[in-house]
């Protein structure tokens, strides 16, 4: 008889999760020569140790500390790109602008991007059937706590001018409940970060409104200013052109203002 399993509301661990994490780690070290010394088996062991045999609704940031300690990477000042609800464009941007980095361009973010995982209390098994859903089950689940932990660390280590890409098509352009709004904003260090520059990405071609005047952006400005960090905002009216100009800055259509 199949052993009884806890049934959660969310989808189960991504198929071949251990193999995927290990393969991604090896690929990352091959593409980033400065990480050539990293022993990916040790990284996987630390990752596994954070959630295996633990009740998946009682995971803490402390559980991920061994992994976070292993994955120490620093981003040069002025090169951190945060994002909220617009991951694809942020990643397209850093793929072109290779000297800027999102969390998913760093080892730990790269390992976990788009994956789901959880274990079961008192067994060494990974649960491929179901994992806790943030809303329906619990917020202290392995995936949510992982992203909270690494996002906090990513924000804490940022320096210089930090950029954030925000989705101008959302009803809340800045959402206090997003990872950016609830974790990253509050963990930028004023003694290291001079300014936060928000790039508000417009959705519609004919949308010429100044979304930097949106009430939620003003709210973000207020939060940031209270933390003694300067705030700037830019409208990106044409994201397609924006990317094209990052690729080809000499293009004549990119040279005007």
């Amino acid at each position: 008889l199949p052993r009884w399993r806890q049934q959660w509301s969310g989808s189960g661990t991504t198929s071949r999760f251990p193999e995927t994490v290990l393969a991604r780690c090896v690929k990352y070290t091959e593409v980033h020569p400065e990480m050539r010394h990293v022993d990916c088996q040790s990284v996987w062991d630390a990752f596994k140790g954070a959630f295996i045999s633990k009740y998946p609704c009682n995971i803490t940031e402390e559980d991920y500390q061994p992994l976070v300690k292993l994955g120490t990477q620093t981003v040069p000042c002025n090169k951190t790109l945060l994002w909220s609800r617009i991951k694809d464009l942020a990643h397209q941007f850093t793929q072109v602008q290779r000297d800027m980095f999102t969390l998913e361009d760093m080892l730990l973010g790269y390992l976990a991007d788009d994956l789901t995982w959880c274990g079961e209390f008192n067994t060494f098994e990974i649960n491929y059937q179901s994992c806790p859903d943030w809303r329906k089950d619990c917020s202290n689940n392995p995936v949510s706590v992982f992203w909270k932990t690494v996002s906090r660390r990513f924000a804490e280590t940022a320096c210089g001018v930090v950029h954030v890409m925000l989705n101008g098509s959302r009803s809340k352009i800045f959402d206090k409940n997003s990872t950016f709004g609830s974790v990253e904003v509050h963990n930028l260090q004023p003694e290291k970060v001079q300014a936060l520059e928000a790039w508000v990405i417009h959705g519609g071609r004919e949308d010429s409104r100044d979304l930097c005047q949106d009430p939620t952006i003003k709210e973000l400005e207020s939060i940031i200013s209270k933390r003694n960090i300067r705030f700037f905002c830019k409208n990106i009216y044409r994201p397609d052109k924006f990317l094209q100009c990052v690729k080809n800055p000499e293009d004549s259509s990119c040279l005007s203002g």
């Epitope: 091959e30 020569p33 400065e34 050539r36 010394h37 990293v38 022993d39 040790s42 990284v43 630390a46 061994p66 300690k69 292993l70 994955g71 120490t72």
Partner: antibody, heavy 118, light 110 residues
Framework: QVQLVESGGGLVKPGGSLRLSCAAS????????MSWIRQAPGKGLEWVAS????????YYADSVRGRFTISRDNAKNSLYLQMNSLRAEDTAVYYC???????????WGRGTLVTVSS | QAGLTQPPSASGTSGQRVTISCSGS????????VYWYQHLPGTAPKLLIY???QRPSGVPDRFSGSKSGNSASLAISGLRSEDEADYYC???????????FGSGTKVTVL
């Protein structure tokens, strides 16, 4: 086969300067990270500095940071170590080494002796 | 610069097995690969083991490496007189952004 030949060692007074060179052959020099490692008399091996391939990034041991500069000339297949403000404790045999993909030092030169003494 | 910890000496009779330990921390051995080098006085050091347990071609299978947590070890089985040398472990240290070597272990064949 891979050959690494160090030169430039010798006797120098404390506070003085010296420039070590390493001539490389037998492999595509520009593709690999390169390093300097030293061994003081009667002591163990100590990593000194490394330089990456591509647009060079440099790494230094705390004991030499700010005094030593590692550099490379890919056109000449050469690695250099400029040593300034030398101290008695810098006395050692200095080895040039080639790093392979996993970070291991696969190939080493025979070393050049640097003596810092008044 | 704190290095890795090795015993200063190890010995065995010909044909015996000798193990050398190497102890580090989470910022070096814990996350990164371990390398082992053999050094005979007056010669260039030689790579014995890379990536914890891999042997370069030409290194006899009498030499084996392993790693667990923040420690590593080198085993020499079937000890021979030509194995008399100094052995060093090494690893990259993330907190120092540099390599750290062990203090070295002198192996003597009795």
């Amino acid at each position: 086969q891979v050959q690494l030949v160090e030169s430039g060692g010798g006797l120098v007074k404390p506070g003085g300067s010296l420039r070590l060179s390493c001539a490389a052959s037998g492999f595509t020099f520009s593709d690999d990270y390169m390093s300097w490692i030293r061994q003081a008399p009667g002591k163990g091996l100590e990593w000194v500095a490394s330089v990456s391939n591509g647009r060079p990034t440099t790494y230094y041991a705390d004991s030499v940071r700010g005094r030593f500069t590692i550099s490379r000339d890919n056109a000449k297949n050469s690695l250099y170590l400029q040593m300034n403000s030398l101290r008695a404790e810098d006395t050692a045999v200095y080895y040039c080494a080639r790093e392979d993909w996993g970070g291991e030092f696969t190939d080493w030169g025979r070393g050049t002796l640097v003596t810092v003494s008044s | 610069q704190a290095g890795l910890t090795q015993p200063p000496s190890a010995s065995g009779t010909s044909g015996q097995r000798v193990t050398i330990s190497c102890s580090g921390s989470s910022s070096n051995i814990g996350i990164n690969f371990v390398y082992w080098y053999q050094h005979l006085p007056g010669t260039a050091p030689k790579l014995l083991i890379y990536k914890n347990n891999q042997r370069p071609s030409g290194v006899p299978d009498r030499f084996s490496g392993s790693k667990s947590g923040n420690s590593a070890s080198l085993a020499i089985s079937g000890l021979r007189s030509e194995d008399e040398a100094d052995y060093y472990c090494a690893a990259w240290d993330d907190s120092l952004s540099g390599y750290v070597f062990g203090s070295g272990t002198k192996v003597t064949v009795l």
